[in-house]
């Protein structure tokens, strides 16, 4: 058993039926030693009397707000939350698996440059009784700091019988090196509580390997005299980290047409600008990505030929 | 949300067996642990036995320990109650209940319930 925070307990149980549980001793916080009574939650069923109180945590039935009280008093209380393992397994009952980049993939997380600044998400079906805290370090070992806000729903979408919910969280490491190569990975780490159910999810990353860039902006079209060739121009996005120069990234322009069939053009560049020739109800689009590092491609940003 | 619906009760003699269905509407079923509930008359709710979202799991009350048997079929929404050996205190009418906490024999760790289906065991 450990404190997660004050006055909440989490019981770590190796479930299995008829496993015999966890023996877990609670102490009431009183300077007081006699006429204690325990109750659990609502009920006014007295388990025990005297300053602690033994209990055999089996299942969920057995966690919740245990309180002690002296003559109509309560003197203090003790949430007793349970962290299961079943198969030598941590349950993940709370978080979806995002399956990308591959299976038990619960947290996924995402730079637009280089500053230190991260945004990670997760997804669950569950709407109600939820809580989430997030911690998070360069290393493990010799941890540097990393400071997160609080997890928000961030979106929430229906997938066919199933609403799912996606929380996020923004985090900035406190002393960002930009240029600098990255030794040590960052961790994440979530704890969720879900009514009397305690699971934790980590992830860890390079900043480098989670780059997405925002999609170019300012994307215009000249087109060229006397030909059906047009200038396809754009700028970097605004939050894509400076000097440009050192930060570079490639682009990928792309003319498709009206149909998703049609044959796609596409031209690689690492200027901001390229010729393509446009055709009757094509659009143009282009995107980023770290010109020396194969991080991910940024969004798409378009423009219709006409 | 979930609607539940049992069904599969009646009137049976001691020593013979009885299949109980529960079956669900409204949310993805396959995201809820699910248990057997019962209440005689007089009595309190009394926990029979769970099945965790997948199907790998389930856990029973000491009285019922080999002689029921909880599965579900998460493709049709259902969850089944096979009960054998049937004794006269088996009597009760018979819940199905779903929640998020498995393994759980508390009724209020449950926030979805059916109607209920009367099983009588007679002597």
């Known amino acids: 058993i450990w404190e997660l925070k004050k006055d909440v307990y989490v019981v770590e149980l190796d479930w299995y039926p008829d496993a015999p549980g966890e023996m877990v001793v609670l102490t009431c916080d009183t300077p007081e030693e006699d006429g204690i009574t325990w109750t659990l939650d609502q009920s006014s069923e007295v388990l025990g009397s005297g300053k602690t109180l033994t209990i055999q945590v089996k299942e969920f039935g057995d966690a919740g707000q245990y309180t002690c009280h002296k003559g109509g008093e309560v003197l203090s209380h003790s949430l007793l939350l349970l962290h299961k393992k079943e198969d030598g397994i941590w349950s993940t009952d709370i978080l979806k698996d995002q399956k990308e980049p591959k299976n038990k993939t619960f947290l996924r997380c995402e730079a637009k440059n280089y500053s230190g600044r991260f945004t990670c998400w997760w997804l669950t079906t569950i709407s109600t009784d939820l809580t989430f805290s997030v911690k998070s370090s360069r290393g493990s070992s010799d941890p540097q700091g990393v400071t997160c806000g609080a997890a928000t729903l961030s979106a929430e979408r229906v997938r066919g019988d199933n609403k799912e919910y996606e929380y996020s969280v923004e985090c900035q490491e406190d002393s960002a090196c930009p240029a600098a190569e990255e030794s040590l990975p960052i961790e994440v780490m979530v704890d969720a509580v879900h009514k009397l159910k305690y699971e934790n999810y980590t992830s860890s990353f390079f900043i480098r390997d989670i780059i997405k860039p925002d999609p170019p902006k300012n994307l215009q079209l000249k087109p060229l005299k006397n030909s059906r060739q047009v200038e396809v121009s754009w700028e970097y996005p605004d939050t894509w980290s400076t000097p440009h120069s050192y930060f570079s990234l490639t682009f990928c322009v792309q003319v498709q047409g009206k149909s998703k069939r049609e044959k796609k053009d596409r031209v690689f560049t690492d200027k901001t600008s390229a010729t393509v020739i446009c055709r009757k109800n094509a659009s143009i689009s282009v995107r980023a990505q770290d010109r020396y590092y194969s991080s991910s491609w940024s969004e798409w940003a378009s423009v219709p030929c006409s | 949300e979930v609607q539940l619906v049992e069904s599969g009760g009646g009137v049976v003699q001691a020593g013979e067996t009885l299949r109980l269905s529960c079956a669900a509407s409204g949310r993805s079923f396959s995201n809820y642990e699910m248990g057997w509930f019962r209440q005689a008359p007089g009595t309190e709710r009394e926990f029979v036995g769970t099945?965790?979202?997948?199907?790998?799991?389930?856990y029973y009350t000491d009285s019922v320990k080999g002689r029921f048997s909880i599965s579900r079929d998460n493709a049709k929404n259902t969850m089944y109650l096979q009960m054998s050996s049937l004794k006269p205190e088996d009597t009760a009418v018979y819940y199905c209940a779903a929640g998020w906490l498995f393994p759980s024999s508390r009724s209020r760790d449950y926030d979805y319930w059916g109607q209920g289906t009367q099983v009588t065991v007679s002597s």
């Open positions: 099945i965790n979202r997948r199907g790998s799991s389930t």
